[in-house]
């Protein structure tokens, strides 16, 4: 906390420039008038001041608006942001994308920070949903974004977003994010053909059930091996081996070097070592010739 | 991160002088805005003594005007801090400093000593 002490004769700030650099603090808190400093903040991104500098120029917006900044000032806050806590952030009315990139931009390159989170939360909720263009700008600054989110709060994201997502941007989702959004990219890309389809939507099958692996398989996709890893077990139990056979097409010869790892080992033990044997990659630990194959699923619906 | 190296610092008698010099490892360094700062005592705050920008114009806090004259080599990557009729309160480690909004990064700084 800086003192509060009278401007020295003379040092009076009549704008915010260059020469406050070289005010102590003191006389930043003594000199520089908090309604003109909110009026110029765009300056202050422009100057090099220290750290503790920002800290008394922060003081004296906070002084100015204790109820939380306004729209306008907060749009040209930039490395000032970084001086806010994630307390001060929700006292914030964030509307405009504008003001979001300006934010992000100042701590672009960095970890998203807890005031980030906050700012992200405030301004999406804001909205009342995770609408394209936010997403779009979210993403292009933190690719590990959406996977960030709680399957509940990907539940907000509709399905026109979904356009702005690429494949990066879910490479750390986990199943249970995947299950929110594969049906709404499939929602999303319906009406695109065959190849243009599976390119958009690969990288949501993580999510796909059984069903809808079956009709891809019917479509001459070529998935490759590092997408079928990546399906879900209880989606691929289910499939045929000649299913599979056309899911992958020329990437089934993949499947040898997959026998050990899960969906691949799994689905393995599900099916008959004689179909396995048609795939020609020696893949063993199918089930043998002769023995009945029980569905004890299916039993257990029917009792 | 660009990494800046302060020396030249010493103990010297009230009225003498010392030059500081400040080498940085960036190439480009011809570009940046440098600036000097003095910190009297650990904790206290850095105080901003001499700036040079890229055309070589130059500003000082009032507290050392016409003693002290910051120049800079770009052929070298360093900037100096000329320091003449020293005073007591000249006392403190000496930091040079990039002067670039949102570069809050240090050198290890230079201990200058002024005994009256």
């Known amino acids: 906390e800086v003192e509060k002490t009278a401007c020295p004769s003379g040092k009076k700030a009549p704008e915010i420039d260059e020469s406050l650099i070289f005010y102590k603090k003191w006389e930043l808190e003594a000199c520089v008038d908090a309604a003109l400093l909110a009026t110029q903040m765009d300056r202050v991104n422009a100057i090099p001041f220290t750290y503790e500098q920002l800290d008394v120029l922060k003081h004296k917006l906070d002084e100015l608006y204790p109820q939380g900044y306004p729209e306008s000032v907060i749009q040209h806050l930039g490395y000032l942001f970084l001086k806010m806590s994630p307390e001060d952030i929700r006292k914030w009315n964030v509307t405009s994308l504008e003001t979001l990139k300006a934010l992000l931009e100042v701590n672009k390159g960095h970890e998203m920070s807890p005031q980030v989170a906050t700012l992200i939360d405030r301004f999406v909720k804001g909205r009342g949903q995770l609408d394209k263009d936010t997403l779009d700008t979210l993403t292009a600054f933190y690719p590990g974004y959406l996977c960030s989110l709680s399957p509940e709060e990907l539940s907000s994201v509709p399905p026109s977003s979904i356009w702005a997502v690429r494949p990066q941007d879910l490479d750390t989702c986990d199943p249970r994010q995947l299950d929110v959004l594969y049906p709404k990219a499939r929602l999303a890309f319906q009406n695109m053909n065959g190849s243009e389809y599976f390119v958009k939507i690969q990288s949501f099958l993580g999510g796909a059930p059984t069903e809808d692996l079956k009709a891809l398989s019917q479509q001459n996709v070529s998935m490759d091996l590092a997408t079928f890893m990546k399906l879900r077990t209880d989606a691929v139990l289910p499939l045929t081996v000649a299913e599979v056979q056309k899911l992958l097409g020329p990437h089934v010869e993949g499947l040898k070097a997959e026998e050990r790892h899960r969906p691949v080992r799994d689905w393995i033990l599900r099916q008959r070592q004689d179909d396995l044997d048609t795939l020609g990659l020696g893949l063993q630990g199918g089930i043998p010739n002769g023995y009945l194959v029980l569905d004890l699923s299916m039993q257990e619906a029917l009792s | 991160q660009v990494q800046l190296v302060e020396s030249g610092g010493g103990l010297v008698q009230a009225g003498g002088s010392l030059r500081l010099s400040c080498t940085a490892s960036e190439s480009g360094f011809s570009a940046n805005y440098m600036g000097w700062y003095r910190q009297e005592a650990p904790g206290k705050e850095r105080e901003l003594v001499a700036?040079?920008?890229?055309?070589?114009?130059?500003n000082y806090a009032d507290s050392v005007k016409g003693r002290f004259t910051i120049s800079r080599d770009n052929a070298k990557n360093t900037v100096y801090l000329q320091m003449n009729s020293l005073k007591s309160e000249d006392t403190g480690v000496y930091y040079c400093r990039i002067m670039r909004p949102g570069n809050w990064y240090w050198g290890q700084g230079t201990q200058v000593t002024v005994s009256s």
């Open positions: 700036t040079i920008n890229r055309f070589g114009s130059t």
